[in-house]
Amino acid sequence: DFGLDCDEHSTESRCCRYPLTVDFEAFGWDWIIAPKRYKANYCSGECEFVFLQKYPHTHLVHQANPRGSAGPCCTPTKMSPINMLYFNGKEQIIYGKIPAMVVDRCGCS
Amino acid sequence: DFGLDCDEHSTESRCCRYPLTVDFEAFGWDWIIAPKRYKANYCSGECEFVFLQKYPHTHLVHQANPRGSAGPCCTPTKMSPINMLYFNGKEQIIYGKIPAMVVDRCGCS
């Protein structure tokens, strides 16, 4: 599997992973103790035919061209969790692994 | 996890899984021995904010609203393989499990 990495200075128009910091406190999510901020990343860019297609299925649907099927879109194809320390509704401090919080790779699907 | 299922008569505008039969022969993929056709399904529809979002990350990116980030799009969130019998480039008949050929569920990511 392969995906492009870009930054704010990139001129890449194709599907790419960009850096993004999520700041929980800025969202008013003040029940999160740690991390206060984390590197989440996001996907953006164009999905030309076959570029960075994750699944053979994507190619097959494109060929079949059913009614209402949009082209593939730039979306996370590999994600990872982060460990968090947070306050739950019962006033307890909880340690937990929260899945799919970080985009590791972007692709067209 | 939850996803909508629709058919060609549905009036659903939101992200939904639709039936789609892939016909290898119609594509000219004559190296595939079996199956000649299979039920692949596909995803189509709108991703309103928070509807069918697979990842908390999708919500966080929406809140952070970085430059160039499109809204979430309707894409497979669960896929399964199919078993296939096909000719390889060396004219050998191969049996293999091909991953991510069937869409089991659609969601917004």
Epitope: Y38, K39, I93 | -
Partner: antibody
């Protein structure tokens, strides 16, 4: 200004317990979590746990679970860290530190706990 | 458990640049803070979120982080910068490096 003042040095025997206090001033005590961090002589820093002074809930580093207890007294704006079943390797300077948005800031002046028979 | 590794010591002449490294697996994917601890003193935060300086911290302190290594740079090092420096990151706990003693020759 924000200040964290800790209790004085302690000498304890192996197997005993120690209770270190940290008195906060210059801010709303119940609005900020408090961490405890220790530093053995000539060593690095080691996070021990965190307490929410508002409700008293805690989370401890795995290494100290079962041996550490963090409590607070809102009437005196003081948090406490009690470590039991002391052994020689618990000899260290123990710090309280306020949980700020950007990190541990500020820190108390530290309390030296010596465990010796 | 996650580990952060620092060199035990770094020496620098006054006015020169001191570079302190902190390495850990995919450390660039995490935010790193740096703490300064003078002899017999409590730690003081000098850098957070890889590159940010808290108010009151001189501009000669800067940070970076990519790949497996975070770096604290002290430009135009002064005698008062002689101290121990600790990197810190969040993984499954608050993790600190072993510390680097900066000596101003």
């Amino acid at each position: 200004q924000v200040q964290l003042v800790q209790s004085g040095a302690e000498v304890k025997k192996p197997g005993a317990s120690v209770k270190v206090s940290c008195k906060a001033s210059g801010y709303t005590f119940t609005s900020y979590y408090m961490h405890w961090v220790r530093q053995a002589p000539g060593q690095g820093l080691e996070w021990m746990g965190i307490i929410n002074p508002s409700g008293g809930s805690t989370s401890y580093a795995q290494k100290f679970q079962g041996r550490v207890t963090m409590t607070r007294d809102t009437s005196t704006s003081t948090v406490y860290m009690e470590l039991s079943s002391l052994r020689s390797e618990d000899t260290a300077v123990y710090y309280c530190a306020r949980d700020e948005n950007w990190g541990f800031d500020p820190w108390g002046q530290g309390t030296l706990v010596t465990v010796s028979s | 458990s996650y580990e952060l590794t620092q060199p035990p010591s770094v020496s620098v002449s006054p006015g020169q640049t001191a570079t302190i490294t902190c390495s850990g697996h995919a450390l660039g994917d995490k935010f790193v803070s740096w703490y300064q601890q003078g002899s017999g003193q409590s730690p003081v935060l000098v850098i957070y979120d890889d590159t940010q300086r808290p108010s009151g911290i001189p501009g000669r302190f800067s940070g970076s982080n990519s790949g497996n290594t975070a770096t604290l740079t002290i430009s135009g090092t002064q005698a008062m910068d002689e101290a121990d420096y600790f990197c810190q990151a969040w993984d499954s706990s608050f993790v600190f490096g072993g510390g680097t003693k900066v000596t101003v020759l």
